[in-house]
Interface confidence: low
Amino acid sequence: FERTRSLQDPCSNCPAGTFCDNNRNQICSPCPPNSFSSAGGQRTCDICRQCKGVFRTRKECSSTSNAECDCTPGFHCLGAGCSMCEQDCKQGQELTKKGCKDCCFGTFNDQKRGICRPWTNCSLDGKSVLVNGTKERDVVCGPSPADLSPGASSVTPPAPAREPGHSPQ
């Protein structure tokens, strides 16, 4: 079947990095400057992505693969294939429409991106606060006073942080 198809369609013989040029009797022509074809048999080449402005080239374009971008320092990628760059904030802050704002009391952010999240409520697990939370760090929960006995571990790790962008249920 493959052999039959290639006899009928000369374009299927064109490898990646070329296109099937209808203007030149369907011969395989190299992709023009700043374009690529990642698969064989293509009738056109795709324009290479250009990483300009806040975007920075992470991987250059070639005749068979598109360029890949990331973000300049002070920004981070958002979206599939780094389609957007979003401003970094400091730890203890979140990005709002008015720029970077400090986390409200009772919330924290230990990253340069994402939203401020509520401190862990130790009492929900019957535990007590061992180390107070800050804008940059969650509280550290310890055992309730009744649980303290010789040889017992005095610290348990905090509950896993929720994914950025998810509000507490």
Epitope: P30, C31, P32, P33, N34, S35, F36, C48, Q50, C51, K52, T57, R58, K59, E60, C61, S62, S63, T64, S65, A67
Partner: antibody
Framework: SLEESGGRLVTPGTPLTLTCTVS????????MSWVRQAPGKGLEWIGY?????SLYYASWAKGRFTISRTSTTVDLKMTSLTTEDTATYFC???????????WGPGTLVTVSS | DIVMTQTPASVSEPVGGTVTINCQAS??????LAWYQQKPGQRPKRLIY???DLASGVPSRFSASGSGTEYALTISDLESADAATYYC????????????FGGGTEVVVK
């Protein structure tokens, strides 16, 4: 950063390989090029190796110059050298977006009998 | 191969003056053009890419423009440190047309 090595005084006809050692970035992410400059003359492009390993040469360089790479080096193999090949040889990083944004200091090749 | 013709070969201007260097491509190069500064005994330094985008750390006294086959680099408020040779450079190669440098322009600052 980029650093060329291997330049020296050779006699005509002697083959020579120059090496460009890279640090701080991956050769899988950037095109790399060799450019030369004869004493008192302008810049002359020799060839490219792209991120996929494909090679591009100036028409005058085809056959006598060969570019290859390892994970951290880009080599330029030169054969049938003549006195006209006396030049400083630079390696440069760059591709389709920015031109050549990073250059090595160059290495001098002198061809003389 | 594409040919880049750069003019003038040499230009002399006083400190504070303005210099314009021209570069003509033998065919349309779609703004895939860079400009470099090179001082004697040093490696080239990229000033401009994409025909008009200023490279990081380059003073705004340097500006460039152009499209199609005609391009220009302008240096205003000349300083003695601008004395160097300047090269234009076509850098898109996927079609196999090859890379090309202009012949260079020596800028002398009086």
């Amino acid at each position: 950063s980029l650093e060329e090595s291997g330049g020296r005084l050779v006699t005509p006809g002697t083959p020579l390989t120059l090496t460009c050692t890279v640090s701080g970035f991956s050769l899988n992410d950037y095109w790399m090029s060799w450019v030369r400059q004869a004493p008192g003359k302008g810049l002359e492009w020799i060839g490219y190796i792209d991120v996929g390993g494909s090679l591009y040469y100036a028409s005058w360089a085809k056959g006598r110059f060969t570019i290859s790479r390892t994970s951290t080096t880009v080599d330029l193999k030169m054969t049938s050298l003549t006195t006209e090949d006396t030049a400083t040889y630079f390696c440069a990083r760059g591709g389709l977006t920015y031109g050549f944004d990073l250059w090595g200091p160059g290495t001098l090749v002198t061809v003389s009998s | 191969d594409i040919v880049m013709t750069q003019t003038p070969a040499s230009v002399s201007e006083p400190v504070g003056g303005t210099v314009t260097i021209n570069c003509q491509a033998s065919e349309d190069i779609s703004s895939y053009l860079a400009w470099y500064q090179q001082k004697p005994g040093q490696r080239p330094k990229r000033l401009i890419y994409g025909a008009s985008d200023l490279a990081s750390g380059v003073p705004s006294r340097f500006s460039a423009s152009g499209s199609g086959t005609e391009y220009a680099l302008t240096i205003s408020d000349l300083e003695s440190a601008d004395a160097a040779t300047y090269y234009c450079h076509y850098y898109a190669t996927i079609s196999g047309l090859g890379v090309a440098f202009g012949g260079g322009t020596e800028v002398v600052v009086k």
